[in-house]
Amino acid sequence: PEPPTACREKQYLINSQCCSLCQPGQKLVSDCTEFTETECLPCGESEFLDTWNRETHCHQHKYCDPNLGLRVQQKGTSETDTICTCEEGWHCTSEACESCVLHRSCSPGFGVKQIATGVSDTICEPCPVGFFSNVSSAFEKCHPWTSCETKDLVVQQAGTNKTDVVCGPQDRLRA
């Protein structure tokens, strides 16, 4: 007989016959025939298949290598891969998160605009006028200069983006 030109969703064409695909979490053992079903088997421990498929081998779960700074964020199942993330203080170098790098610190004169996550690095911003940062940090924002006036003091030394203002006592008015 002439073969069908297309099979339905969740089916595949083999030997002029439409066969059911194996469901996620299972691999193909043998193709169907006209009067037998597709034979599928569940994936083994540490294996997965995440789509309707005709794969004869399941994929291995991703290994979150601690030597690369990785740890398991979500354990894999027979239908999903393991999701890795980075240890505290590190972030992934790519979307696939195959390795990690240390979070960047913001140098003096710069503050943290956005704290790093497991997948994104620290974002720094220069301290604007009126703010300073005198440390290299992955957490500290720019701090506002001290307000001498509220302490009944006067500015003795102007602040910079790296240093706070220095306050001092007001000069006594001479009689």
């Epitope: 007989p1 002439e2 073969p3 069908p4 099979c7 339905r8 089916q11 002029s16 016959q17 439409c18 066969c19 059911s20 193709d31 169907c32 025939t33 006209e34 009067f35 037998t36 079903e37 597709t38």
Partner: nanobody, 124 residues
Framework: QVQLVESGGGLVQAGDSLRLSCTAS????????MAWFRQAPGKERDFVAA????????HYADSVKGRFTTTRDNAKNTMYLQMSSLKYDDTAVYYC?????????????????WGQGTQVTVSS
Amino acid sequence: QVQLVESGGGLVQAGDSLRLSCTASGRAFNTYTMAWFRQAPGKERDFVAAISRDGTITHYADSVKGRFTTTRDNAKNTMYLQMSSLKYDDTAVYYCAARRVGAVPERESAYEHWGQGTQVTVSS
């Protein structure tokens, strides 16, 4: 796509014979595995017989083995069910069905196309 129409049903006496036909309209009849199912009043639809695309392989329910024979004529886009030694228990609406997916013959859900059915009544 195929559309299926059954014919040949009717009222017969126990022990009589009857031949049902299932005619398909549409293309590529010879790419479909065909089957007969039946549904008695108040019961579920049951598998009766199936035939391979080229007509060389047939399967039958135990209840009809040796009494019913299914054949097909791909040139005429038609499948037949020859029923003999009919019994009162054979009374049902008989449906023909077609599928392209490989499956065990009895699996009703594998059949993609169904006819409207033809009534067979066997009086005792």
